[in-house]
Interface confidence: low
Amino acid sequence: LQDLCSNCPAGTFCDNNRSQICSPCPPNSFSSAGGQRTCDICRQCKGVFKTRKECSSTSNAECDCISGYHCLGAECSMCEQDCKQGQELTKKGCKDCCFGTFNDQKRGICRPWTNCSLDGKSVLVNGTKERDVVCGPSPADLSPGASSATPPAPAREPGHSPQIIFFLALTSTVVLFLLFFLVLRFSVVKRSRKKLLYIFKQPFMRPVQTTQEEDGCSCRFPEEEEGGCEL
């Protein structure tokens, strides 16, 4: 006997018990593929979620996060609280980035400043909580005849030879590197992983009506202790 259910299009379900009739999905449900034997319940965007795309008979609703939160996970399965630039989200809320780290976004964790000396470069612009350092030219770029894509070095004062400039640049780079290393070595930067505000897709809601009776949410926090920024 031919399986007539395979002829049922998306947006319907195949009712085996009624001579395999293709019936439309009930309200607040969908089937995204043909031949389904039942329709899936629609996702409801409640709580910290807002609707980006309404549910239709052939596709599930799509959610975004309300203002002050951003999406995480596949299909925006969770919402995480926004912080300001220069901050990261910890167990205790938004905290300023520790010295030597920065975050230029409203999400994510503080990242260490770039270590210019690892590339043989010098620090042209100091880093802040919101911005990474800007690396300047390497000492080799300061010697005559060298070509570089980095910004040109400031005009030299008359009377100073390239050798002296090279020596000063090298010394300052080493000193900066040592300072940077010491700061990182002795600062206690225990960065918490993200505090995720998990909002599960739907607790119990109406399969037939479009309103939801209650929101289900679960807040899970990292177990590790919160670190400070003391030196």
Epitope: F13, D15, N16, N17, S23, P26, G35, Q36, R37, T38, C39, D40, I41, R43, N60, K201, Q202, F204, M205, R206, P207, V208, Q209, E213
Partner: antibody, heavy 117, light 107 residues
Framework: QVQLQESGPGLVKPSETLSITCTVS????????VHWVRQPPGKGLEGLGV???????NYNSALMSRLTISKDNSKSQVSLKMSSLTAADTAMYYC???????????WGQGTTVTVSS | DIQMTQSPSSLSASLGDRVTISCSAS??????LNWYQQKPDGTVKLLIY???TLHSGVPSRFSGSGSGTDFTLTISSLQPEDVATYYC?????????FGGGTKLEIK
């Protein structure tokens, strides 16, 4: 022929977690939902929760904090986990296939769970 | 949650009798109601879905009616194999809830 078969531990101690599996044969979990129902001795049926073809779940609001329903489509198995058991959770546990406009057209035979120390 | 109330909780009837079981919902559920039969050995079977649609393989002596909040399961001529407990179940709103059951015996 579609069949659902529950398998569970039988006896569980209070405060422990119950784990029951429903094995489905002759039917695809990507086309049908599976609902869990329990029946305490001498009492009526109580719906626990459902897992839909797409994998999303709904739980009985009174038990939501203790329940987890998941599935493995490749093994045709649906599992129910219930934590923090008490004597009140002693019951016959059934799984049933959800089809059409959400009726349970095929039921398992049920598995008896006794919560006792 | 929607409360489902069945009456009577038990009844005894003679073979060939017409039997009716009532089910009442605490709020309107349109026609989103199913009926199930649980035999003494614990086996559960679907009888009727969407208030009045007979499930495949169910004898025609079973029928269902009603709408909104009041529903009825009718057995037109009671047979020995009908000894069981009957449950109504709404699916208008999750959580899907069952009535308390009606135990049917033969006199």
């Amino acid at each position: 022929q579609v069949q659902l078969q529950e398998s569970g531990p039988g006896l569980v101690k209070p405060s422990e977690t119950l784990s029951i599996t429903c094995t489905v044969s002759g039917s695809s979990l990507t086309s049908y939902g599976v609902h869990w129902v329990r029946q305490p001795p001498g009492k009526g049926l109580e719906g626990l929760g459902v897992i839909w073809p797409g994998g999303s779940t709904n739980y009985n609001s009174a038990l939501m904090s203790r329940l987890t329903i998941s599935k493995d489509n490749s093994k045709s198995q649906v599992s129910l986990k219930m934590s923090s058991l008490t004597a009140a959770d002693t019951a016959m546990y059934y799984c049933a296939r959800v089809t059409g406009t959400w009726y349970f057209d095929v039921w398992g035979q049920g598995t008896t769970v006794t919560v006792s120390s | 949650d929607i409360q489902m109330t069945q009456s009577p909780s038990s009844l005894s009837a003679s073979l060939g009798d017409r039997v009716t079981i009532s089910c009442s919902a605490s709020q309107g559920i349109s026609n989103y109601l199913n009926w199930y039969q649980q035999k003494p050995d614990g086996t559960v079977k679907l009888l009727i879905y969407y208030t009045s649609t007979l499930h495949s393989g169910v004898p025609s002596r079973f029928s269902g009616s009603g709408s909104g909040t009041d529903f009825t399961l009718t057995i037109s001529s009671l047979q020995p194999e009908d000894v069981a407990t009957y449950y109504c179940q709404q699916y208008s709103k999750l959580p899907w809830t069952f009535g308390g059951g009606t135990k049917l015996e033969i006199k």
